[in-house]
């Protein structure tokens, strides 16, 4: 008799999830010499232990602590790039500007990027059919709690000038409900972080507005200022040119400073 399975509103665990995590771990530790000491089997065991046999709406940050410990990594605290709703450009940027880091350039972020996972209460099975949706089902699901945990730690580690890339094509350029707006902003440490600099990325050439004057950016400025952190903002009108000038800063057509 087939056992009844909880149907959630979100997509199920990514196909070949265990193999993907393990393979990513091996690849990452091969590429990054400072992480070569990491035992990827132990990392997978800790990852699995965070959600297997647990109700997927009852996951806590504590469940991920063994994984956090194994994935402890030091990145230059003054070279952190946060992003919201514009992941691809942020990643293209750090692929060129190799001394800057998004969360997904760290081991734990790299392992989980674009993946979904959940288990079932009291069974060792991974649920490949469906997983809880943050809005429709529950917020304390394995994926959401993971990103909340690693995002908080990443923001806490930041110092000096922290950059954030924001999507100027969205109706809410700064969204208080995004991971950046709900977690990272509130976990920047005022005693370490001097300035948050926002780069507002424009979507098309016909948009000549100064999006740094957008009401949601003013809201972000207010939140940051109340936390005794300075705020600055730049319009990136031409993201294609921006990336090009990161690659070729000496070119005569790249006179602006990033």
């Amino acid at each position: 008799v087939p056992r009844w399975r909880q149907q959630w509103s979100g997509p199920g665990t990514t196909k070949r999830f265990p193999e993907t995590v393990l393979a990513r771990c091996v690849k990452y530790t091969e590429i990054h010499p400072e992480m070569r000491h990491v035992d990827c089997q132990s990392v997978w065991d800790a990852f699995k232990g965070a959600f297997i046999s647990k109700h997927p709406c009852n996951i806590t940050e504590e469940d991920y602590q063994p994984l956090m410990k194994l994935g402890t990594q030091t990145v230059p605290c003054n070279k952190i790039l946060l992003w919201s709703r514009i992941k691809d450009l942020a990643h293209q940027f750090t692929q060129v500007q190799r001394d800057m880091f998004t969360l997904e350039d760290t081991l734990l972020g790299y392992l989980a990027d674009d993946l979904t996972w959940c288990g079932e209460f009291n069974t060792s099975k991974i649920n490949y059919q469906s997983c809880p949706d943050w809005r429709k089902d529950c917020s304390n699901n394995p994926v959401s709690v993971f990103w909340k945990t690693v995002s908080r730690r990443f923001a806490e580690a930041a110092c000096d000038v922290v950059h954030v890339m924001l999507n100027g094509s969205r109706s809410k350029i700064f969204d208080k409900n995004s991971t950046f707006g709900s977690v990272e902003v509130h976990n920047l440490q005022p005693e370490k972080v001097q300035t948050l600099e926002a780069w507002v990325i424009h979507g098309g050439r016909e948009d000549s507005r100064d999006l740094c004057q957008d009401p949601t950016i003013k809201e972000l400025e207010s939140i940051i200022s109340k936390r005794n952190i300075q705020f600055s903002c730049k319009n990136i009108y031409r993201p294609d040119k921006f990336l090009q000038c990161v690659k070729n800063p000496e070119d005569s057509s790249c006179t602006s400073e990033i």
């Epitope: 098309g204 000549s208 319009n235 009108y237 294609d240 090009q244 070729n248 070119d251 057509s253 602006s256």
Partner: antibody
Amino acid sequence: EVQLLESGGGLVQPGGSLRLSCAASGFTFSFYDMSWVRQAPGKGLEWVSAVSLYGDETYYADSVKGRFTISRDNSKNTLYLQMNSLRAEDTAVYYCAREPVSYDYYGSYFDYWGQGTLVTVSS
Amino acid sequence: EIVMTQSPATLSVSPGERATLSCRASQSVSSNLAWYQQKPGQAPRLLIYGASTRATGIPARFSGSGSGTEFTLTISSLQSEDFAVYYCQQYNNWPWTFGQGTKVEIK
């Protein structure tokens, strides 16, 4: 030395088609937006079309929208303008022009121009 | 779109004299304005951008001023090679638009 050399102009009947080319040299072509600007005989300058660095964004004046197509081949350092459904009022010298775009600044002017190619639409 | 209006249509000036050309925008274009010179049978040449910055290789006798909606190109002492048509262009709002031109002729 920056050089822009247009070609492909000529006499064409109304409703006909032409493809203009602009060969660029003396600079890194893919670092610049490029535009076509035209000038009817004895008249002023009119911007026609522009294309972004990699050709993924294109822009057109209302007067040519749906009839003209701008494109570029960065491997060949060449800008193109495919002109279909040509009308008498499209008769002009067509210039290709370089735009020194900046990523943190919206607008742009034209810092180098080709010598132009004449397109005559007449029956 | 923004309409650029140049005046006068024709300016008659003697060599060595000062020439003042005006360009007006139908709405503010901040300082996003360029000036071009065009001689018969030739392509336009960039003179001024950012309303007042001379392009590379442009003589100091050419100067630009203004912001918002009113702009001026001044040629302090006209040389024989300066007799040409001059165009202004705004690049503050899409699409970029040109003025109709001012012809500077020998008096």
